[in-house]
Interface confidence: low
């Protein structure tokens, strides 16, 4: 999917109001310095492409992120604010919410969500170089 025509400000608002807090909740108990950010993005469409990939595509050692609260809200935001992004995603999100069971959080998932936090920050802000 080409994210070029998304309403970035609306997606940004969704991230700031809810998704970011859900990401922090998922990472609770993990030091912010524990994982190095190895994934980056150059512009907002690229960032959304990377965010979608990390959030919804199962990877070795982390297959369950799509059922997390932040993922469901991300999917809803993309469905609402990205023209042509599959409208059925909202229905799929609701169905997922009903049958969702908490999975064991693996270290690989924590690392992946840490990367997601970095991508979202890059989407909303320049990649800050903390001194």
């Amino acid at each position: 999917y080409d994210f070029t025509n998304c309403d970035f400000e609306k997606i940004k608002a969704a991230y700031l109001s809810t998704i970011s807090k859900d990401l922090i909740t998922y990472m609770s108990g993990t030091k912010s310095t524990e994982f190095n950010n190895t994934v980056s993005c150059s512009n907002r469409p690229h960032c959304l492409t990377e965010i979608q990939s990390l959030t919804f595509n199962p990877t070795a050692g982390c297959a369950s992120l799509a059922k997390e609260m932040f993922a469901m809200k991300t999917k809803a935001a993309l469905a609402i604010w990205c023209p042509g992004y599959s409208e059925t995603q909202i229905n799929a999100t609701q169905a997922m919410k009903k049958r969702r069971k908490r999975k064991v959080t693996t270290n690989k998932c924590l690392e992946q969500v840490s990367q997601l936090q970095g991508l979202w920050r890059r989407f909303n802000r320049p990649l800050l170089k903390q001194q």
Epitope: L16, S17, S20, P126, L128, K129, Q131
Partner: antibody
Framework: EVQLVESGGGLVKPGGSLRLSCAAS????????MHWVRQAPGKGLEWVGH??????????DYAAPVKGRFTISRDDSKNTLYLQMNSLKTEDTAVYYC???????????WGQGTLVTVSS | SYELTQPLSVSVALGQTARITCSGD??????VHWYQQKPGQAPVLVIY???ERPSGIPERFSGSNSGNTATLTISRAQAGDEADYYC??????????FGGGTKLTVLF
Amino acid sequence: EVQLVESGGGLVKPGGSLRLSCAASGFTFSDYWMHWVRQAPGKGLEWVGHIKSKTDAGTTDYAAPVKGRFTISRDDSKNTLYLQMNSLKTEDTAVYYCAREIYYYAFDSWGQGTLVTVSS
Amino acid sequence: SYELTQPLSVSVALGQTARITCSGDNIGSKYVHWYQQKPGQAPVLVIYGDNERPSGIPERFSGSNSGNTATLTISRAQAGDEADYYCQAADWVDFYVFGGGTKLTVLF
């Protein structure tokens, strides 16, 4: 060490103009969204406006009371933030601070402030 | 327009716990930050993102935020904590909003 140093404040008559500067050091200035915040004598803090980093298009936003009169700009090559104030009013009298923004819209570093007095 | 409401003043006995509130419509959905300002000085960030402490800020400072109220808690209050405290949040209409400020007095 992060440092922000404002200059350019002073006494100006109503309707006049003034340009404030904020010299930044100790961090990669171009990466950050930068702000002006003011504080009238004995009053609270009031956000004036900001300028985004060039990677976020370098656009500006302003608080309603100053929109159309104040202009924020930046020179990343000089690590300097500016505030051009036109059509000044007596209610613009305040200490003006420049501030650096970090994640979640918080200001983690502030200058010492420069006093602007608008009086006839 | 979005408004943040703080009490004008709060008093606390030396060594006791001070709580400063900041009220706003559904403020729990926003990140809240707290600044300390001493007379003649620039503000200093003491809490950001509801409950995060910048480096150099004592663990005695903590924050919470839910519903319509955010709270700055200062444990074991010291004389040096006497200052004005401002809450701040971001709003999509008014951008960056500050509370009116709370004067904290430490009683001996």
